[in-house]
Each structure stands twice: as C-alpha cells, then as structure tokens.
C-alpha cells in the first residue's frame, strides 16, 4: 500500500510568492512559492495519486506583514483552502501568546493541530482542551494513518507560551502516544513535528513504532540528486535512520518559506512496516502556475496590508541615525534602537535566578539601510521601517562561546574605515577598540551584561563561557564574513521577522528617543 506525503514546514507567512531568496517578490517571472502555486501542485498530485496526505510541520506564524496584520487568521484561512490534513505546532505559533494561537488558528482550523509534548495546566487546561491533540488517526483510502505531533521543548525560550503550558521531552512524550495508537491497531504512524533535524533523527531512532518522521524548525534541505536551486542539501531525501529496534525510518524536511513542497512516497506492508521510501522536495518555481482562485483570494486579503503600511506605529522625538556614515563607523542610535528592540522581544523570565535568558545583541551596521527623520511629526510607519530593514530577515537566538564573540568583534573592525558592513552595533555589550593595533588584536575591552543576576551589570567576557546572543539570521549564517559565528555556533533558533520586532517595540514604547551612550568606544 502506497502513501504519498506532501509536506511543508517553516513557511513563516510567505503566503504570496517570493524571490528565490524568500524575500519580497520583485520580478514575478522568477518568483517562487506562495499558497496559490502550492495549491496548483498539491491538486495536481491529488488528482494523479490515490492516497495523499498534506502535512505542515509548524511555524506557519511570523515572518511577513501578513502575520503582523492578520495575526494567524490568514494561516487558518489559506491552510483550510488548501485542505491540509494536519499541522504540528511550532514555537512561533506562540508568538502572540496562547490567546493568539487559540482564537485565530486553533478555533478556525478545519484540520487537526497536533503536539504530544505540550501539556496544559491550570485554568488553560479546560479552555484549550480538544483544540489541539497529541495525535490524530486519519482515514486514507481503505487504511488509517496515525499522525503524532511534537514541538520544540525550547519554546518557552523562543516564544510566549505563558506559564500554563508545559513543554515535555519529545521522546518521553511521544512513546506512550505511539503505544496507544498501536493498541488501537493503527500500524502506520507518522511523527510530525517542530524540533529540528537532530531531534527528528533521534525520534526516528528512539520512538518504537514511528514509521516516518516529518520535521521542521531547522530549515533543513534534503535532496537526492542535483539540487534545483541555491540550497545545499544536508543529506539525501529521505534521510534514513536505523532505529534501535532495527528498522529503516525515513526522515524528511522541506527547507522553509514555502519554496519547496516535500514529496515522499512510502510503501507499507500489511503490518505497517515501511518497505520502501523515495521522493524529493519539489521546487515551486514559476513553471508551476498560481491557482487563479487562491490568487484572487490573496489579492483580496492584500488590500488591508497596503493600508497598514502607512499607519503610525509610534513616534520618535530624535533623529534615528541609520546612515552608513554613522552605523558602519561608530555607535549609531538606530543600531541601539534595533538592538534594544531585539532584547525586548526576547524577554522571557523562565528562571528566578536569571533576570532574563539573554542580554546581548549584535547587529551588522551594513544591515541598517536608512535613517528616519523625526521632522515628519515624529511619525514612524511600517513603510519607514521597511526602508531601514528591507531584507526580510529574522532576529535569531544563538549560543556562542566567549571566544567566538571575541573573534566576531575583531572581525567587526579588521578593515575599519572602508565603510564596510561588518561593523557591529550592539546591545548589552560594552566594547572598546584600539584601532592603532593590528587587525585581529584591536579589541582591548569586551564587557557583557550579566543574565544570572538580579541587578544587571557589565562583567568581562569569559572565553570559555557559553553566551546567548540575539542577532540577524544573516550573521548566524556567516554573512558579512562572520564565518566564525556560522562555524562555531552551538545552537541556532530562528526568531521573529526583523521589522516586526522593531515595530512591536515602537508601538509598545509609543515615544522613543534612543541615544548614543558609549556602548562602542
């Protein structure tokens, strides 16, 4: 019996088609993805093949103005329209708190939303009961398939799930649910979830009875053969894991941003064992037409976005200096504003010993593309912020050793004076450079804000200590020559859309007046 699994993950509100790098579509003839194009391909496969499931492995939320404005209603609407069969909860589904998940998505979705390792307690338990499930048994043809969900247990550090949701260890939580499915005579079981490729592989290895793992969170691109676009495969598709009980378990993920549709064909025997698995992600490029009815719906929903872009978010009473003449040479107040917003967006008081789990921010000066003049009545709009941060990136959470941070700050000024983009703006860091010294030895003082303290203060950076840092995804991926970050990072979790982070901060503060205050000397 053959099952076709179509899967997406980490779509991050790319409802409209995008450019090849998943930023705003400029030249339509070369654009990719989007729900209208996705629907065309899904329908084509549904017509051609008998047993098809369309699954999403989480993080539909967060990433473009679509989410900022519609707050998840757009996810429910278009996933319903595409007739998704199931979705796993990702960490970003909690970005607007539990209410921001329940009302727009959980209550509106016509498909099951799954996570076996999230347990509700207190007053939330009854409120959320039945709105998400640990597993769901889906009829497919004359067979049944069990889908069991999981979500990164790091979610309390990455999003805003509140205090009434407990995130358990994935493997510990999954095993009893899979066992339950087995007692219900469900012998074909897919683990669908959002914990990253390493955890996906562990689930395949450790959870008895899981036949296939469909994952997300790490934006992993897998491919067999010659890849069709710029993404470099992390392994073959599917990636085969030998389980502890001697089975071959296929593990898949489909990169991110709706650029690809994962396509996996699985052959099951009478006992639900996987006899064979093969497939590849399908690049959703312009050779696949956008479905006209979905496209028309997208255009209808778009109208509200255009109006939102020009509305006032808050005011500034000072000039926001985002000029390259400032931000690529010295501390600039636009850099300070953005870093302050990045830290504010990551306030998570999850431990009494820590005032926060992260206190540091770094930001490449070259990523700041425009100033904002306060002489327009001080008004700041989304449109203004899009000029400052035009690349559609995210502000991510990484873990780095002190020694890596030291290398990063040396790189920041290794060719100082040439107006290059690698000059770092900071938050929660005091750095002193001596530019008379030779490149690679110019950082003379590097103090960082403590986290395990009730009164935050600056202490010297320790080379062997592991620090959490908020930074643009561009830097986490080694951009602007920061290869040491990419090579040496110990953990990397994708964060919120850059403009959204700053816009939320400005809306919260109402009036802003960031200063140049001696962070960089």
């Amino acid at each position: 019996w053959e099952l076709t699994i179509l899967h997406t993950n980490d779509v991050h509100s790319r409802l409209e088609q995008t450019s090849e790098d998943s930023s705003k579509c400029v030249n339509a003839s070369r654009c990719m993805g989007g729900v209208a194009r996705l629907f065309t391909k899904v329908q084509q496969i549904r017509r051609a093949e008998p047993n098809v499931l369309l699954l999403d492995a989480g993080d539909q939320y967060q990433g473009t103005i679509w989410f900022t404005v519609y707050k998840g209603a757009e996810v429910a609407h278009f996933m319903n329209a595409l007739r998704y069969d199931a979705m796993a909860l990702g960490n970003h589904e909690f970005d607007n708190g539990v209410e921001g998940l329940i009302e727009p998505l959980l209550k509106e979705a016509k498909f099951p939303i799954l996570s076996a390792n999230i347990k509700a307690k207190g007053p939330l338990a009854s409120q959320i009961s039945g709105l998400y499930l640990p597993y769901k048994v889906l009829p497919v043809g004359d067979e049944v398939v069990g889908i069991v969900g999981y979500t990164s247990k790091e979610t309390p550090f990455l999003s805003n799930p509140g205090t009434n949701l407990v995130f358990e260890d994935e493997i510990t939580a999954l095993q009893p649910e899979v066992d339950k499915l087995k007692t219900l005579n469900v012998n074909k079981i897919i683990a669908l979830g959002h914990s990253g490729f390493e955890m996906d592989k562990l689930i395949a290895q450790k959870v008895r009875g899981v036949d296939v793992v469909v994952g997300g969170h790490s934006n992993t691109f897998l491919y067999t053969g010659n890849p069709p676009s710029k993404e470099v495969p992390a392994g073959k598709y599917p990636f085969i894991v030998t389980s502890d009980d001697g089975r071959k378990v296929p593990v898949v993920q489909a990169y991110a941003f709706g650029k690809y549709l994962g396509y996996l064909k699985i052959e099951f025997d009478e006992r639900g064992n996987v006899i064979s698995s093969h497939g590849n992600p399908i690049l959703l490029n312009s050779s696949i037409p956008e479905d006209p009815s979905i496209k028309a719906d997208i255009n209808k929903w778009r109208i509200k976005l255009d109006n939102y872009s020009t509305q006032e978010l808050g005011k500034t009473i000072v000039y926001l200096d985002g000029s390259s003449q400032s931000c690529r040479f010295r501390e600039c107040n636009m850099g300070n504003l953005i870093c302050d917003a990045m830290i504010n967006n990551n306030l998570r008081h999850t431990d009494e010993m820590f005032w926060n789990h992260v206190s540091m921010c770094i930001l490449n000066g070259g990523g700041i593309r425009s100033p904002i003049d306060e002489r327009n009545n001080g008004t700041i709009t989304w449109e203004n912020l899009a000029a400052v941060l035009p690349f559609g990136g995210t502000f991510d959470l990484v873990q780095l050793k002190g020694s890596t941070l030291k290398k990063a700050f040396e790189h920041s000024v290794h060719r100082y004076g040439q107006s290059t983009g690698e000059f770092l703006q900071v938050g929660g860091i005091h750095v002193v450079y001596d530019l008379s010294r030779k490149p690679g030895d110019r950082v003379v003082k590097l103090d960082v804000l403590c986290t395990k303290c009730r009164v935050p203060s600056y202490d010297p950076l320790k080379m062997d200590e592991v620090y959490k840092v908020i930074l643009p995804n561009f830097l986490a991926n080694g951009g602007d020559g920061f290869q040491m970050i990419k090579d040496e990072l110990l953990r990397h979790d994708s964060g919120d859309q850059d403009i959204n982070v700053v816009s939320t901060y400005i809306s919260k503060m109402k009036v802003i007046y960031p200063a140049v205050e001696g962070r960089i000397k």
């Epitope: 071959k248 009478e270 064992n273 996987v274 006899i275």
Partner: antibody, heavy 113, light 106 residues
Framework: EVTLKESGPVLVKPTETLTLTCTVS????????IQWIRQPPGKLLEWLAV???????DYNAAFISRLTISKDTSKSQVVLTMTNMDPVDTATYYC???????WGQGTLVTVSS | DIQMTQSPSSLSASVGDRVTITCRAS??????LNWLQQKPGGAIKRLIY???SLDSGVPKRFSGSGSGTEYTLTISSLQPEDFATYYC????????FGGGTKVEIK
Amino acid sequence: EVTLKESGPVLVKPTETLTLTCTVSGFSLSSYGIQWIRQPPGKLLEWLAVIWSGGSADYNAAFISRLTISKDTSKSQVVLTMTNMDPVDTATYYCAGQYGSVWGQGTLVTVSS
Amino acid sequence: DIQMTQSPSSLSASVGDRVTITCRASQDIGDRLNWLQQKPGGAIKRLIYATSSLDSGVPKRFSGSGSGTEYTLTISSLQPEDFATYYCLQYAGSWTFGGGTKVEIK
C-alpha cells in the same frame, strides 16, 4: 492483529479440482494483495499466484492453465482453485501477504486415490 | 523470471557461532528481499524485510545486508532456537525463493 488462515480439503483425488480459501484479518484486501505458495514434503517453497489489491492476478507460468485466483473483499477472503490435481501436487499450501510479512500456518493437501 | 541462488544449502554449527547465509539474484532486485525462517513444524516467519530491516520481535542477533544482486543474512551468535531452515525471497518481480539453508546442530 494481522492474521491469515488457509482452509480447504486435506485429501483430493487425482484429476479433481482443489479449492483453497485464505481468510484475512487485520488488513483490507482493497489495500493489499495475497500470494499463494506451496511446499511439497521435504522440498522447496514454490510460488503459485498473487491477486493484487486492485483485483488483477499473476500466475506462475508453469501452472497458468490450472490456476484461478479470486477474492471477495467484503468477506476478506481469497480463493485459489487448481484443476486436474495429481499426486505430485501433494504439498503444504500457504497463503501470505503481498510483502510476506504475514503467513498462514499452511494446510497439507494430499492427492491420492 | 528472477532466479535466486542461495548458499550453502546446509551447514552445521554450534551455539554461539556466527553464521552467514548468502543469496545471489539473477538481476538487480533493488533491496526488495526478505529472509524467512521455517521451523520443523512448517510454520514460516519473516525475519528481515527490505534487505536489512528487522521484523518486530526478531532478536537483534539477526541482521541483513546487501544491494543489487548480492544479499546476506547473518546470525551473530547462534542460539538453540535458531536451528531451522532459512530462505531468501525476492519480491521485485513475481516471487521467487532461494533453495533454502538448513542450519543444523554440529
């Protein structure tokens, strides 16, 4: 639980037709095929026929004129008939799932006058 | 038809021995190979499917490997209950079996 069970006569006379039934539980014949295999005493396993989930059938070329396989999906039963039986057809007859994950316990059929 | 050549046809071994049985297909069968165990009573049980995946409840001393036309069943440490006849079965085309290997007590 996935099980298969063969049933039919234990003794048939030469030239007669053998009719064997395989009753399936735990999976659907609309999703999976059924294979028939036999093993003469002290000899090797020999594949006879398969009926696929869609209803089409394939036969061992050596027996194609003598074999017919059919199924009743609603009853979860597959029937194999073998005409013109001969003493050399004495064997244990097994039905098995399409992929061999499950086998019946086998039924010994003796061809003798 | 695809022919399956299994060797040896029989072997004598002691408890604790490592036993290897091989099957050669007349053409590439693309990992579509099972290993079956038949006890003297006649009951047939699949041990390994798709070349190397272990069936539920089968001890880990059994392992399968191979690709293309060459396939191997290994019993890492023979136990008393393992004395039986073993068959390879290809399902890339119409089923064909190897000639069987009878594993006897030395």
